[in-house]
Amino acid sequence: AGVFELQIHSFGPGPGPGAPRSPCSARLPCRLFFRVCLKPGLSEEAAESPCALGAALSARGPVYTEQPGAPAPDLPLPDGLLQVPFRDAWPGTFSFIIETWREELGDQIGGPAWSLLARVAGRRRLAAGGPWARDIQRAGAWELRFSYRARCEPPAVGTACTRLCRPRSAPSRCGPGLRPCAPLEDECEAPLVCRAGCSPEHGFCEQPGECRCLEGWTGPLCTVPVSTSSCLSPRGPSSATTGCLVPGPGPCDGNPCANGGSCSETPRSFECTCPRGFYGLRCEVSGVTCADGPCFNGGLCVGGADPDSAYICHCPPGFQGSNCEKRVDRCSLQPCRNGGLCLDLGHALRCRCRAGFAGPRCEHDLDDCAGRACANGGTCVEGGGAHRCSCALGFGGRDCRERADPCAARPCAHGGRCYAHFSGLVCACAPGYMGARCEFPVHPDGASALPAAPPGLRPGDPQRYL
């Protein structure tokens, strides 16, 4: 067990052009506070994943009012350290998110308004018990300077806070086989309580006789490096030679998540999804209320009516989750109709519409024929975001402006001759054929095979195609 400590040194405009405007004004005084979120290992720093190592919120800083015309200086900071207690071993590698929040103190309806000014994230290696590490991170035009360290809480010592120390029982030396606890030379390493053979570097225990592995190690004594590359199954220890994971007790067996958290296995360990109001590696930290600023991304916090809903975050557009920690892929809901292209701009959603469609969601089918005239008696037909003209006989083209040659396609069969006519075409059939397109042979006895000639027309007469 131990504590991760974060000291913020300054938050203000970064070097270079484009200094940010002061977040506070005479009309809207404000004060800053900070939130830190820690995750074990070199995991992604995505704001959505839980702060499995823990999280902490600073006190509010002094009220600040901008001096008119003055550039934004380094802003007044809250007193004290941000402290994130960790119950288990310090993982050695960790990811962090540090958020700078502004609390506006104007006449807000319903209390002060919070907004996120900057978020920085990183991945670091850090041994517990070491000196303060200094860091500078930039977020847009802002710059954050800070230091951090991890320290063990007695009786734990060591780079992972896994060795236990006790005050010396004898003034001169430690008991048989027990070393002095550097840097606490007046203390001795406690008698070994872990399972015999448990790796002192990669294993630790909280109860006598157990051996729990640090991230990246497995096996009953935590001596086997995890390597899943040649394995088929995602669980448990196997032989010390391959370091391959084969079925064994799963990390979620017995549900290590407290307070109703649900456990899911990760490639190397487990992850607890905590119910509202709890956080920490095992959901062991409770008592979160709106005063702790639990809503991310500008979510509005209101008190819940029930202990299991200690606070409720009303999320701004584009975010969801009990803490507004998840960015919504709003385009996955396919909001753009009629084949429009969806663009999630963060602050808004845009649809780029196909030709012939308009509206915020491409929901309007444009009147394709509006203002479109078809010449020469043609009629406009809408369809699929484009218009076309159905042309009168003798005309063609997009707008029926072109005079069509009805004989161009050689419509008269069996050598019939085609004549263009004001209302279409006429076929003069070769001897032995009849029909509008000369398609029917005439039988030698003078009767037609199909169909009978209309009254008043003799077989062989030119027949007009209507």
Partner: antibody, heavy 117, light 109 residues
Framework: EVQLVETGGGLVQPKGSLKLSCAVS????????MNWVRQAPGKGLEWVAR??????????YYADSVKDRFTISRDDSQSMLYLQMNNLKIEDTAMYYC????????WGQGTLVTVSA | QAVVTQESALTTSPGETVTLTCRSS?????????ANWIQEKPDHLFTGLIG???NRAPGVPARFSGSLIGDKAALTITGAQTEDEAIYFC?????????FGGGTKLTVL
């Protein structure tokens, strides 16, 4: 709109049993704790029982006056809440309400339980 | 077992501001008690007004507001109306147990 509809009330003799049901609609029932509250004729409100959600192992809590006689349960698949009442006493006569607390309080219309000889 | 105490009755006039309070026998009421206010009108018509100390339910007029005043939870009606005449119950959570006050009968004359 959240709807809570209680059924199962009626007239029962002392030491008898009754099972109340509450059908819930228009919210994600599985996520939330649920409660039964009652109001005896001419009296105030009395909380009876609470059952938490699956994430909290369906933990149950009871008012001292009904402990060991009443059992609260839920069927998440059907969005139903139940109250099994055994060894009923005359003082259990009341209107029983299915109540859900989240950002504020949601009430059903109630079902009347009358315990009388 | 905690006891929650409310004024048994209060009288106000239309347009006046009236404050109903809710005291806990275990000490100061805090946000972790998630104070709730419920209105009862004739025929067992219950309406949740306020949840989580100060969270007004949708559709509840803005004249109703919840807060902590001193060591008590409070329901303030700013500009009472005749239709606000009802019985008001406060409920406080103690971990997973809920305790109601005896109710305040509000008369708007």
């Amino acid at each position: 709109e959240v709807q809570l509809v209680e059924t199962g009330g009626g007239l029962v003799q002392p030491k008898g049993s009754l099972k109340l049901s509450c059908a819930v609609s228009a919210f994600t029932f599985t996520t939330y704790a649920m409660n039964w509250v009652r109001q005896a004729p001419g009296k105030g409100l009395e909380w009876v029982a609470r059952i938490r959600n699956h994430s909290n192992n369906y933990a149950t809590y009871y008012a001292d006056s009904v402990k060991d006689r009443f059992t609260i349960s839920r069927d998440d698949s059907q969005s139903m809440l139940y109250l099994q009442m055994n060894n009923l006493k005359i003082e259990d006569t009341a209107m029983y309400y299915c109540v859900f607390y989240y950002d504020y309080v949601y009430w059903g219309q109630g079902t009347l339980v009358t315990v009388s000889a | 077992q905690a006891v929650v105490t409310q004024e048994s009755a209060l009288t106000t006039s239309p347009g006046e501001t009236v404050t109903l309070t809710c005291r806990s026998s275990t000490g100061a009421v805090t946000t972790s008690n998630h104070a709730n206010w419920i209105q009862e009108k004739p025929d067992h018509l219950f309406t949740g007004l306020i949840g989580g100390t100060n969270n007004r339910a949708p559709g509840v007029p803005a004249r109703f507001s919840g807060s902590l005043i001193g060591d008590k939870a409070a329901l303030t009606i700013t500009g009472a109306q005749t239709e606000d005449e009802a019985i008001y119950f406060c409920g406080l959570w103690y971990s997973n147990h809920l305790v109601f006050g005896g109710g305040t009968k509000l008369t708007v004359l």
